[in-house]
């Protein structure tokens, strides 16, 4: 019962986490204009992985997609890649874990296979969560570096007469969503791995021993004492570990929008 609960909870937590990773990846507010200690502008800038937006005090919001691929910073490309890998691994992990759930019966699938799949999905969730956390952290580090660089030369101009205020960017909501989502996916993955251990108890396998009694002969083949309720072979509860996590390469494309809100 506890194993089923752990597996189910791990699945739900991972599902929420992956939904969060997808949301964070699609969000426009990865970096937002720093308003602290800044002249009050009637324009608010914010940027995502796929487009940058400007919200005017008039209420109009203009978003422009990054239509170039080669012109983008390598770090941004790396963050995109990490987030997409995280989503892909998480999606595959979710698919695998659905079939691995103890509460779902699919044909005559053995518990050993379910244990395998639970472990596989758990590992996938852990890697997915780590990818998201890494992606968000790389972006956050990039922001911190740029923030202090722009602070160092915040006011530039001609002889100090005409001032140009540089726009500084700080952490956007997407970063916090990404960190939390990555953490949840990671926790879900760990829970799946723990559930897998519960699904696969250590078995004491004895070699079949023949006892020859006078008058009649009986062969005893005992199974694992935890798994079987009596003598004889109990293959239904046998656990076999063979797999590692397998990944597939997927490309996720996001449409660029140019909209006014």
């Amino acid at each position: 019962m506890a194993v089923t609960a752990c597996q189910g909870l791990g699945f739900v937590v991972s599902l929420i986490g992956i939904a969060g990773i997808i949301a964070a990846t699609c969000m426009d507010q990865w970096s937002t204009q720093d308003l602290y200690n800044n002249p009050v502008t009637a324009v608010f800038n914010y940027q995502g992985l796929w487009r940058s937006c400007v919200r005017e005090s008039s209420g109009f919001t203009e978003c422009r997609g990054y239509f170039t691929l080669l012109g983008l910073p390598a770090m941004l490309q790396a963050v995109r890649a990490l987030m997409i890998v995280g989503i892909v691994l998480g999606a595959i992990g979710l698919l695998v874990s659905i079939f691995a759930l103890k509460c779902i019966r699919i044909g005559s699938m053995e518990d050993s296979a379910k244990a395998n799949m639970t472990l596989t999905s758990g590992i996938m969730f852990i890697v997915s969560g780590l990818c998201a956390i890494a992606g968000v952290s790389v972006f956050a580090n990039m922001l911190v570096t740029n923030f202090w660089m722009s602070t160092a030369n915040m006011y530039t101009g001609m002889g100090g007469m005409v001032q140009t205020v540089q726009t500084r960017y700080t952490f956007g909501a997407a970063l916090f969503v990404g960190w939390v989502a990555g953490g949840l996916t990671l926790i879900g993955g760990v829970m799946m791995c723990i559930a897998c251990r519960g699904l696969a108890p250590e078995e004491t396998n004895y070699k079949a021993v023949s006892y020859h009694a006078s008058g009649h002969s009986v062969a005893y083949k005992p199974g694992g004492f935890k798994a079987s309720t009596g003598f004889g072979s109990n293959t239904k509860n046998k656990k076999i570990y063979d797999g590692g996590a397998r990944t597939e390469d997927e490309v996720q494309s996001y449409p660029s929008k140019h909209d006014y809100v």
Epitope: Q33, T41, E56, S57, G59
Partner: antibody, heavy 118, light 113 residues
Framework: EVQLQQSGPELVKPGASVRMSCKAS????????VHWVKQKPGQGLEWIGY????????KYNERFKGKATLTSDKSSNSAYMELSSLTSEDSAVYYC???????????WGAGTTVTVSS | DIVMTQSPSSLTVTTGEKVTMSCKSS????????????LTWYQQKPGQSPKLLFF???TRQSGVPDRFTGSGSGTYFTLTISSVQAEDLAVYYC?????????FGTGTKLEIK
């Protein structure tokens, strides 16, 4: 046709208050911010502030804080400006205008003339 | 507050002539987020309300004749009328739309000979 219809001229005594209206028509009132601008006779334009009819969020020019109060009423598609403790310095034409792209003002009312005189 | 300086304060021209007026801001009105200049030009004819000519420094408002051109970036902007018509008699104002409070220039009065 998009229009902003402003209330008629006001003749008020010093120290009194005045409330003028700006009725919008021809567009969705809550989708656009309404700005108020002051123009003294023969002089330039001065921005007073704006109100967002959607959420009643407002922003004021520091010079007009305590002097002007901006409100709006979604049901009547109208924006209002109340000027308090009037002095001769407040004698001017007050325009309401609709905010557009680039924070520009694309539609203007005909203006409300306020004359402060004893 | 951002100071908007317009020059000349007034100019008298004959119809068909080309006219250029300038507007200088005390700080850059260029927004790095979209590379747009938050400067607006208005025309106010005698006894009328102001009329929007250009927003984002150079984007012409619909209905504005193409003899009017807005240009410039950062802190220096110009409004050009390629061939002045009698109906262009007005005061032209530039406005900072980037920083609060929004500020207007003192205006350039265009008079026809």
């Amino acid at each position: 046709e998009v229009q902003l219809q402003q209330s008629g001229p006001e003749l008020v005594k010093p120290g009194a208050s005045v409330r003028m209206s700006c009725k919008a028509s021809g567009y969705t009132f809550t989708s656009y911010v309404v700005h108020w601008v002051k123009q003294k006779p023969g002089q330039g334009l001065e921005w007073i502030g704006y109100i967002n009819p959607y959420n009643a969020d407002s922003k004021y020019n520091e010079r007009f804080k305590g002097k002007a109060t901006l409100t709006s009423d979604k049901s009547s598609n109208s924006a209002y400006m109340e000027l308090s403790s009037l002095t001769s310095e407040d004698s001017a034409v007050y325009y309401c205008s609709r905010s557009y792209y680039g924070n520009s003002f694309d539609v203007w009312g005909a203006g409300t003339t306020v004359t402060v005189s004893s | 507050d951002i100071v908007m300086t317009q020059s000349p304060s007034s100019l008298t021209v004959t119809t068909g002539e080309k006219v250029t007026m300038s507007c200088k801001s005390s700080q850059s009105l260029l927004n790095s987020g979209n590379q747009k200049n938050y400067l607006t030009w208005y025309q106010q004819k005698p006894g009328q309300s102001p009329k929007l000519l250009f927003f984002w420094a150079s984007t012409r408002q619909s209905g504005v004749p193409d003899r009017f051109t807005g240009s410039g970036s950062g802190t220096y902007f110009t409004l050009t009328i390629s061939s002045v018509q009698a109906e262009d008699l007005a005061v032209y104002y530039c406005q900072n739309d980037y920083y609060f409070p929004f500020t207007f220039g003192t205006g350039t009065k265009l008079e026809i000979k």
